[in-house]
Interface confidence: medium
Amino acid sequence: AHTAAPQVTSTASKLLPPVAFNHTIGHIVLSEHKNVKFNCSINIPNTYQETAGISWWKDGKELLGAHHSITQFYPDEEGVSIIALFSIASVQRSDNGSYFCKMKVNNREIVSDPIYVEVQGLPYFIKQPESVNVTRNTAFNLTCQAVGPPEPVNIFWVQNSSRVNEKPERSPSVLTVPGLTETAVFSCEAHNDKGLTVSKGVHINIKVIP
C-alpha cells in the first residue's frame, strides 16, 4: 500500500506536472436518429489532492439535467484514471455542436479539446415559396432556402411538374418568373448528399382584373 501524499499548497502546485485531458476523437459525423457515444478521459496523479467532478459543456453552456453521462473512476497506485462517458440516443439536428469536458484540479480549471458532433440529414427548408396572386404577364420572384448538414444544398425549381432550371443553384435561390398567363404550381427541390426534399407545391394565381 502507498502512503497518502502530503497536502499540496498553492505554491507547491506550480511545481506539479501539468495535467490535461487525453486526446480523443475530434469530429463525429452521423445521420439523424442514430445513437452516439463519446468520452473524455484524464489521469490524475496522487500528488494532486483537490479534484472536482467532470462537467460536460456544449457550445459554451454547461449540460445539466436530462443528458446521459456517466463518470467512471479507475484508481491504482499512481493515481486515478477518470473516464466521463456521454451518450445521445436518436440524435437530432439540435444536437449539432462542440462538446467538451471541464474539471477543476487544485483550483485550476482544465478544459478538454472539443468534440464536434455533426448530425446530417436531408435538406431542411427554412424558407420556401409562398402562394401569391400575380398580375397576368407581370414578373415576380419566389424564394427557396434549405440547409444541411451536409452542405452544400442545391436547389432545383419545378413548375407544373417540369424542372425550370437544368443546372442547380446553391441555396438560397430566388426564381424570377417573367410572367404567367395562367395559374401554375411551383415547388422547389433541395438536394444534398443525403437525399432530396421537395417543398409543398404553391399555387400562383392570376388576378382577375375587374
Epitope: 439523424e32 419545378v158 427541390e189 438536394h191 437525399g195 421537395v198
Partner: antibody
Framework: QELVESGGGLVQAGESLKLSCKAS????????ISWVRQAPGKGLEWIAY????????NYAHSVKGRFTISSDNAQNTVFLQMPSLTASDTATYFC??????????????????????WGPGTLVTVSS | DPVLTQTPSSVEAAVGGTVTIKCQAS??????LAWYQQKPGQPPKLLIY???TLASGVSSRFKGSGSGTEFTLTISDLECADAATYYC?????????????FGGGTEVVVK
C-alpha cells in the same frame, strides 16, 4: 412491413401487362416506390419511380413514354402498366421502397437515394 | 449521366478470408453510393448506403469506403453465406428527372 408484387406471367410480344405492388405495414404516402427489373442472368435496372403522397413520377430513358407508373393510395398499391411488350422486357420485376427517413416534416416529399425494402419479385416472360 | 463500373466481375476467396470489390463512377457522385447483396432467387438486400453507413441489421464485417469516383466494399472474415452477387448503386438528378443507376455486379464465390 412488406411489399408484394403480382401480375407477371407469360405474354406474346406486343401484348400488355399491368403489374401491382401491394404495400403493407407502411405509411404509403410518405415513401418513394420504384420498379427495378432484372433480366435472366443479368444485372439490376431501375425503370420507374413514384412518390404516392405527392404524385411525383419518374422514368428511366429505356421505358419513358411506354410504361406508366401509378398508385391507388387507398389500396396502398403501386402499378406498372406495360403496353407493347417486347422480348427485351423479359425480366423479374421488383418493387422497392426508399430508405426510411424519420427526420422529416409532414407535408414534404423525401427521396433518400437508396432502396431498403424489396418485394420478392414477379416474373414477366415475353415470347416472340 | 454517371456510369458505375464494378471490378472484378467475379472473385473467389476462402472462408475466413477478405474480399474487396471496387466501384468506379464516371463522374463525381460525392458519397451518394449504396451496396447491395443479392442471392439467387431473392431480391437485393441493402448493405451500405451513403458510401460507408451500415444498413440496419447488417454485419460489421461489411465495410464501405470512398467518395467522389472511387468506392470500395470490403467483406472480411468471409462466411459461406456471403456467396452472392454484389451491386453498387447511385442516384442523380431531381425528384421528377432523377435516375437510379446500378453497377454491373460482382459475383463472390466462397470456397
Amino acid at each position: 412491413q412488406e411489399l408484394v408484387e403480382s401480375g407477371g406471367g407469360l405474354v406474346q410480344a406486343g401484348e400488355s401487362l399491368k403489374l401491382s405492388c401491394k404495400a403493407s405495414g407502411i405509411d404509403f404516402s410518405s415513401y418513394g416506390i420504384s420498379w427495378v427489373r432484372q433480366a435472366p442472368g443479368k444485372g439490376l435496372e431501375w425503370i420507374a419511380y413514384i412518390y404516392p403522397g405527392f404524385g411525383i413520377t419518374n422514368y428511366a430513358h429505356s421505358v419513358k413514354g411506354r410504361f406508366t407508373i401509378s398508385s391507388d393510395n387507398a389500396q396502398n398499391t403501386v402499378f406498372l402498366q406495360m403496353p407493347s411488350l417486347t422480348a427485351s422486357d423479359t425480366a423479374t420485376y421488383f418493387c422497392a421502397r426508399d430508405l426510411d427517413y424519420t427526420g422529416g416534416v409532414v407535408g414534404y416529399a423525401y427521396v433518400t437515394y437508396y432502396f431498403t425494402l424489396w418485394g420478392p419479385g414477379t416474373l414477366v416472360t415475353v415470347s416472340s | 449521366d454517371p456510369v458505375l463500373t464494378q471490378t472484378p466481375s467475379s472473385v473467389e476467396a476462402a472462408v475466413g478470408g477478405t474480399v474487396t470489390i471496387k466501384c468506379q463512377a464516371s463522374e463525381s457522385i460525392s458519397s451518394r453510393l449504396a451496396w447491395y447483396q443479392q442471392k439467387p432467387g431473392q431480391p437485393p438486400k441493402l448493405l451500405i448506403y451513403s458510401a460507408s453507413t451500415l444498413a440496419s441489421g447488417v454485419s460489421s464485417r461489411f465495410k464501405g469506403s470512398g467518395s467522389g469516383t472511387e468506392f470500395t466494399l470490403t467483406i472480411s472474415d468471409l462466411e459461406c453465406a456471403d456467396a452472392a452477387t454484389y451491386y453498387c448503386q447511385t442516384y442523380y438528378g431531381g425528384s421528377t428527372t432523377g435516375w437510379y443507376v446500378f453497377g454491373g455486379g460482382t459475383e463472390v464465390v466462397v470456397k
